[in-house]
């Protein structure tokens, strides 16, 4: 049993790791492998991860990892029964992919704008808090070629545009995500969509 | 720079309890982990008890889980080891220790407070 592509892990920083990995041939992850992890701290404990199968060669593992801060850091170990296949290290604060923005919400009554609110998804103790900023993807149902992606720089969960912006008369479906540049992370996943129609009436011309 | 004090060590009967406690000066830079260490005459020095300040999360060796509580009034930059049960092999100079990003948690020490246990 040889593992092809090594564990690769990503931190939501909260509390949850993910490790992923391929093997070099067909493996039932969840009877064959274990993936055990420790925290490098004076008398912690060890853990062991049950990977999931993610295709026909690929193993997930989703690591708890309780409070993280800056200073962790962890063993790897991948055993397939009493075989070490693999041993390595994760830093959580170096490899952080955020969780996805919660409770997208589009105000459609606010005078001729759109109001897009989320909600940040950590708490407020946590240091990703206030590091957050956001994309924001806004697309036409029923044309493809026809969207856009806002960046909202500033940390505040909402962003304002014109209704007069999109087509009139078209549903229109929103999703966000959301990056820490601080801590270098990946984007997160997008959150779910909301959706809603666009019924903004261009004003009648005068000639 | 931090400063580390020990304080409530003393004498006590097999059975007994004691609490011993360590006053946190200077720097709060240590906030990454902190733990009490012990020596015995003639033995290495061996880590007993081990916490993680922002949760409180502890760890214990396996000669005094059960007996043994590390606890931190964060008020008080204070750590405290609560000993019950206590056992004439629990005898030995304690130490608190402190770190700020090293989770062997032995960037700063302190100068020990003796615990004696007699049967």
């Known amino acids: 049993m040889k593992v092809l592509q090594e564990p690769t892990c990503v931190s939501d920083y909260i509390s949850l790791s993910t490790c992923e990995w391929k093997m070099g041939g067909p493996t039932n992850c969840s009877a064959e492998l274990r993936l055990v992890y420790q925290l490098v701290f004076l008398i912690s404990e060890t853990n062991m991860c049950v990977p999931e199968n993610n295709g026909a060669a690929g193993c997930v593992c989703h690591l708890f990892m309780e409070d993280m801060v800056g200073a962790d850091n962890y063993t790897l170990d991948l055993w397939a029964g009493q075989q070490l296949l693999w041993k390595g290290s994760f830093k959580p604060s170096e490899h952080v992919k955020p969780k996805a923005p919660e409770n997208l919400t589009v105000y459609t009554n606010v005078s001729e704008t759109l109001l897009l609110t989320w909600s940040n998804p950590y708490p407020p103790d946590n240091y990703l808090y206030e590091k957050l900023t956001y994309a924001v993807n806004i697309w036409n149902e029923n044309d493809p070629t026809d969207s856009r992606i806002y960046d909202v720089t500033y940390q505040e969960p909402t962003l304002r545009i014109a209704a007069s912006t999109l087509k009139s008369g078209v549903s229109y479906r929103a999703r966000v995500r959301a990056w820490a540049q601080s801590y270098n992370s990946t984007w997160s996943e997008w959150s779910p969509s909301t959706k809603w129609y666009n019924a903004y009436k261009e004003p009648f011309e005068k000639h | 720079q931090v400063q580390l004090q020990e304080s409530g060590g003393g004498s006590v009967q097999a059975g007994g309890s004691l609490r011993v406690s360590c006053a946190a000066s200077g720097s709060t830079s240590y906030r990454y982990c902190m733990a009490w260490f012990r020596q015995a005459p003639g033995k290495e020095r061996e880590a007993v008890a081990s916490i993680r300040p922002r949760s409180g999360r502890a760890y214990y060796a396996d000669s005094v889980k059960g007996r043994f509580t590390i606890s931190l009034d964060n008020a008080k930059n204070t750590l405290y080891l609560q000993m019950n049960s206590l056992k004439p092999e629990d005898t030995a100079m304690y130490y608190c220790?402190?770190?700020?990003?090293?989770?062997?948690?032995?960037?700063?020490w302190g100068k020990g407070t003796q615990v004696t246990v007699s049967s």
């Open positions: 220790a402190a770190s700020d990003n090293d989770g062997n948690c032995q960037d700063y």
